[in-house]
């Protein structure tokens, strides 16, 4: 059966830093989502080989991609407190398959010591609520991404 390997299980990062989330599968996908879990799950990105990736506006200009849909690394930059949450990879196949999740804890720099990851993978029953909208940079610098996309930051 198809599986999604996702790493890391958990990461603690200061405000303004970046985080890498990797989603790996054995292939045979149509595409892959990174979703932020919570009472109302939000799709953060959709990536399909040969197609310009689509991103949630909250992450406009803050996401890079590298690899392919079978082995995709998503880098989220300039993290904000409101980005704290559990992110899971969702492989689009005949039957959707999910990764184990990555708990991203974004902390104020001075509070780094008291809120750190344990080694256990995040549990789906105890997921933080998705953040409310946050300020977005202007997107317009402005020509289109090439198709297929380069692994560079979106405008």
């Amino acid at each position: 059966a198809q599986e999604v390997q996702q790493s890391p299980h958990c990461t603690t990062v200061p405000v303004g830093a970046s985080v890498n989330i990797t989603c790996s599968t054995s292939g045979g996908l149509r595409g892959i989502y990174l979703r932020q879990l919570g009472p109302q799950p939000q799709d953060i990105i959709y990536y399909e080989d040969g197609v310009v990736p689509t991103t949630d506006r909250r992450f406009r200009g803050r996401i890079d991609f590298s690899g392919s849909q079978d082995n995709l690394t998503i880098t989220m930059h300039r993290l904000q407190l409101s980005d704290t949450g559990t992110y899971t990879c969702q492989a689009i196949t005949e039957v959707n398959v999910y990764g184990s999740g990555t708990l991203v804890l974004v902390t104020e720099e001075q509070s780094q010591g008291w809120h750190r990851c344990s080694d256990a993978p995040p549990r789906a029953s105890a997921l933080p609520a998705p953040p409310t909208g946050s300020a977005l940079p202007d997107p317009q610098t402005a020509s289109a991404l090439p198709d297929p996309p380069a692994a560079s930051a979106l405008p």
């Epitope: 149509r30 595409g31 959709y46 689509t54 689009i92």
Partner: antibody
Framework: EVQLVESGAEVKKPGASVKVSCKAS????????MHWVRQAPGQGLEWMGW????????NYAQKFQGRVTMTRDTSISTAYMELSRLRSDDTAVYYC???????????????WGQGTLVTVSS | QSVLTQPPSASGAPGERVTISCSGS????????VYWYQQLPGTAPKLLIY???QRPSGVPDRFSGSKSGASASLAISGLRSEDEADYYC???????????FGGGTKVTVL
């Protein structure tokens, strides 16, 4: 080949509801938002809302809040738009359109259905 | 009343250049991409310009889009009879959290 095929024309009485379907083929249905846009006779295009076929999440234009419901059936790659409490000024061609682009919800509609004429008349 | 403002009509003789304007605000055109659609009589709209100035494959280079501040424009050079259609601009609106359209411009080839 990407195709969006809508259901046939409908005639409804004021106060009734109508449900229009849009069957998608030729691409990963759950990978792209489906938008609904309508056009009254001789008038311009009016965005009604979208559905995210992956999650089922929706976003409706304020004008249609409370009257429109967008759903999907991923097993048959079909999106639906139901409009209730119909009035004569809801007479229009209703289009489904696939949304692509850099951001979810962007009005970058690369494929459109053929349109469904809904006539509201007593 | 449309959120984006377009002139209701524009015209030109074959071979001429016609420009259609689309005026918005800082919450839509001013901070987001603009899209242009062509609608021939009795047909569904067709994407003409995306990301403000990009043409999908198959769209002739006679069509070009540009954007400055909170306004955008579509130019059709070397006007041809088959360009006679309605043209609509669209953009995301940050305030409304959704797409908005212009009222449309009918282009007539004289």
């Amino acid at each position: 080949e990407v195709q969006l095929v809508e259901s046939g024309a409908e005639v409804k009485k004021p106060g009734a509801s109508v449900k229009v379907s849009c069957k998608a083929s030729g691409y990963t249905f759950t990978g792209y938002y489906m938008h609904w846009v309508r056009q009254a006779p001789g008038q311009g295009l009016e965005w009604m809302g979208w559905i995210n076929p992956n999650s089922g999440g929706t976003n409706y234009a304020q004008k249609f809040q409370g009257r429109v419901t967008m759903t999907r059936d991923t097993s048959i790659s079909t999106a639906y738009m139901e409009l209730s409490r119909l009035r004569s000024d809801d007479t229009a061609v209703y289009y489904c359109a696939r949304g692509v682009g850099l951001w979810f919800g962007e009005p970058y509609f690369d494929y459109w259905g053929q349109g469904t004429l809904v006539t509201v008349s007593s | 009343q449309s959120v984006l403002t377009q002139p209701p009509s524009a015209s030109g003789a074959p071979g001429e250049r016609v420009t259609i304007s689309c005026s918005g605000s800082s919450s839509n055109i001013g901070s987001n991409y603009v899209y242009w659609y062509q609608q021939l009589p009795g047909t569904a709209p067709k994407l003409l310009i995306y990301n403000s100035n990009q043409r999908p494959s198959g769209v002739p280079d006679r069509f070009s889009g540009s954007k400055s501040g909170a306004s955008a424009s579509l130019a059709i050079s070397g006007l041809r009879s088959e360009d006679e259609a309605d043209y609509y601009c669209a953009a995301w609106d940050d305030s409304l959290s959704g797409p908005v359209f212009g009222g449309g411009t009918k282009v007539t080839v004289l």
